[in-house]
């Protein structure tokens, strides 16, 4: 019976027309939701002007529905038995999951000033760009409203910088109308054990921001895993939003309506420093923000983001060394609110649950040449918000589940 | 070594214009900015602008603004400066000079211009 | 615009004497003064830049001290191939400006 149930479950994992995993796996049969909490900025004036320590209050959650369009691209390669891909992104905002709206203003750090006074360092350009700071009356904090923040505004110092660059800053811009990829990932047909694992990414096995083995395209996109998961398993995925591959390690069992699921989890470990964990010795890519790579639980990003120094975290600082949190007031982290966690089905390998939580910052540093950065006696990463995208099966989805699977098993 | 070397000298006929080069050597160029001092005959130092050889962007003193035009060739490592409508006033020796972390640490031997009918 | 002020325009001292030339700004540049060497047919050479940190090679009998609006050049014994012309420049706003100069000769 085991052996039959095993052959069902390689047949309906395969990515390839006609069956259940590819249907889910082209248009996800669960509705995923990303919510935001904003990090608003209580004492802008205290902190330029004293370089006190900035007291943030998060407000949200602010919620869109995501990840409802289906795969675009889609053609299968029978040759090295892999299928590709293009992930599209919409963001549509649901009112009844907010506190809120969209026009609700936010005091935040002004993105392009915090950015343009780290990529151009030469003072000569850094004194170019405090006559333009100065003239466009922008300073180290900005108000913006939620939809400017996350999806794009005009930035009127960079409307006025006399060479070309993008003027138009947001968090996730562009979002709407653009896609993720393209991915090639193995289609199983050949090899069960290779299923969803991604071969390349935008045409390539390696990422080329980080040293080593830093640099890998490992695992999945964690939307599912190769059938027959065990415990002792290390799950290596890929995650696009932060420009790494990371993994989760098992924690305990869950019943997820009345589905028996691994609950997998991101350990502290992945976000330790090279000290604590060698392993991680190549996400440590400069020495005085990160105090030689003994800070730990914030992972540099800027070389994934055109040399914008944005750093990457979970929320509320959660696993980061104190050094990090030390000059924000106003976060409390906790495992429970803030850690990522995938609740896997382990004989077909699926993500039947999760909640991805992550936390976007900014590096702002002293500037001796721009006047609104002149003040500041040290760097700062600087929360803008955190987010939790969250995904469950549905009941129907569930009970079909239950009854063509876990069912049948037991 | 850290070189910047200058064209020649140039005499021009007022109303015509004219293009000073400055190819430099001996570092990454486009991690330093270039930049432009006049020197009237036995008279003091004047900025006239300097640029980011990454991405051309350029700033002038107000009243050089009509008068010089600045240019680099990443290529080559070599920026210009062109100097239009020229008259007797814009006789004098003109210096390029590098520019990072210090101001002007390292210049060219300079070029001197005469104009004159 | 910063104008700078430089005095005296002209010095005429004796070998080892003491030498002291100020520039004053019009506007606050905290301490971004540079002082330049010029001989006669050569480019200026940077002695001392920002913050009245002495550039490397440069001889310590040249010192620089000020902040703000009013600062202070000086050679502390005076040898003749000291003999050149020296200017100020201000690197804290655009444009950045000199000063006027001042002509050092032997007494």
């Known amino acids: 019976g085991d052996l039959l149930i095993q052959k069902t479950i390689k047949k309906q994992v395969v990515l390839e027309e006609g069956t259940i995993a590819f249907k889910n796996w082209v248009k996800t049969g669960t509705e995923v939701y990303r919510q935001f909490w904003i990090f608003d900025v209580q004492n802008p004036q205290e902190v330029m002007m004293n370089s006190s320590n900035i007291q943030v209050k998060q407000r949200g959650p602010y919620t869109y529905r995501v990840r409802f369009l289906a795969k675009e691209n889609v053609t299968q390669d029978a040759e090295d038995n892999t299928v590709s891909f293009l992930q599209p992104n919409g963001a549509i905002f649901e009112p009844s999951l907010s506190v809120g709206t969209e026009a609700d203003n936010f005091t935040v750090l002004n993105l392009a000033v915090a950015a343009a006074s780290h990529i151009y360092q030469n003072q000569f350009v850094q004194m170019i760009l405090n006559s333009l700071i100065n003239k466009s009356k922008s300073s180290m904090f900005q108000v913006r409203t939620l939809r400017e923040l996350l999806w794009g505004y005009r930035d009127p110092f960079l409307s006025l910088v006399p060479y070309p660059v993008t003027t138009t800053v947001g968090l996730f811009y562009p979002y709407n109308n653009t896609a993720d990829g393209v991915y090639k990932v193995f289609n199983g047909k050949d090899n069960i054990s290779k299923v969803a694992i991604i071969d390349t990414y935008k045409g390539k096995r390696n990422l080329s921001y980080w040293e080593s083995h830093c640099d890998m395209i490992n695992g999945t996109d964690a939307a599912s895993f190769p059938p027959f998961v065990e415990k002792s398993q290390v799950l290596q995925f890929f995650s696009s939003d932060i420009c790494r591959s990371i993994y989760a390690v098992f924690e305990s069992d869950v019943n997820l309506k009345g589905i028996p699921v691994y609950r997998f989890v991101l350990p502290s470990k992945a976000f330790a420093s090279p000290v604590e964990n060698p392993d991680n010795y190549c996400f440590c890519t400069e020495k005085i923000i990160s105090k030689n790579c003994t800070s730990y639980g914030v992972l540099d990003i800027s070389k994934c983001k055109e040399g914008r120094p944005v750093y990457i975290s979970l929320p509320h600082f959660l696993y980061a060394s104190p050094d990090v949190s030390e000059p924000i007031d106003g976060l409390n982290p906790n495992e429970e609110e803030h850690r990522t966690y995938l609740d896997i089905e382990p004989i077909t390998g699926f993500t039947l649950q999760f909640a991805k939580r992550l936390q976007v910052n900014l590096l702002v540093k002293p500037s001796e040449k721009i006047q609104v950065l002149k003040n500041l006696k040290r760097n700062y990463i600087v929360p803008i918000l955190w987010l939790n995208e969250t995904g469950t099966i549905g009941d129907e989805k569930a009970n079909m589940f239950r009854s063509q699977v876990t069912g049948k098993i037991n | 070594e850290v070189q910047l070397q200058q064209s020649g000298p140039e005499l021009v006929k007022p109303g015509a214009s004219v293009k000073i080069s400055c190819k430099t050597s001996g570092y990454t160029f486009t991690e330093y900015t270039i930049h432009w001092v006049k020197q009237s005959h036995g008279k003091s130092l004047e900025w006239i602008g300097g640029?980011?050889?990454?991405?051309?962007?350029?700033s002038h003193k107000q009243n050089f603004k009509d008068k010089a035009t600045l240019t680099v060739d990443k290529s080559s490592s070599t920026a210009y400066m062109e100097l239009r409508s020229l008259t007797s006033e814009d006789s004098a020796v003109y210096y390029c000079?590098?520019?990072?972390?210090?101001?002007?640490?390292?210049w060219g031997q300079g070029t001197t211009l005469t104009v004159s009918s | 615009e910063t104008t700078v002020t430089q005095s005296p325009a002209s010095l005429s001292m004796a070998i080892g004497e003491k030498v002291t030339i100020r520039c004053i700004t019009s506007t606050d540049i905290d301490d971004d003064m540079n002082w330049y060497q010029q001989k006669p047919g050569e480019p200026p050479k940077l002695l001392i830049s920002e913050g009245n940190t002495l550039r490397p090679g440069v001889p310590s009998r040249f010192s620089s001290s000020g902040y703000g609006t009013d600062f202070v050049f000086t050679i502390e014994n005076m040898l003749s191939e000291d003999v050149a012309d020296y200017y100020c420049?201000?690197?804290?706003?655009?444009?950045?400006?000199f000063g006027s100069g001042t002509k050092l000769e032997i007494k």
């Open positions: 000079a590098r520019a990072g972390d210090y101001a002007f640490d390292y």
């Open positions: 640029i980011i050889p990454n991405n051309g962007g350029s």
């Open positions: 420049l201000q690197s804290g706003t655009l444009p950045f400006t």
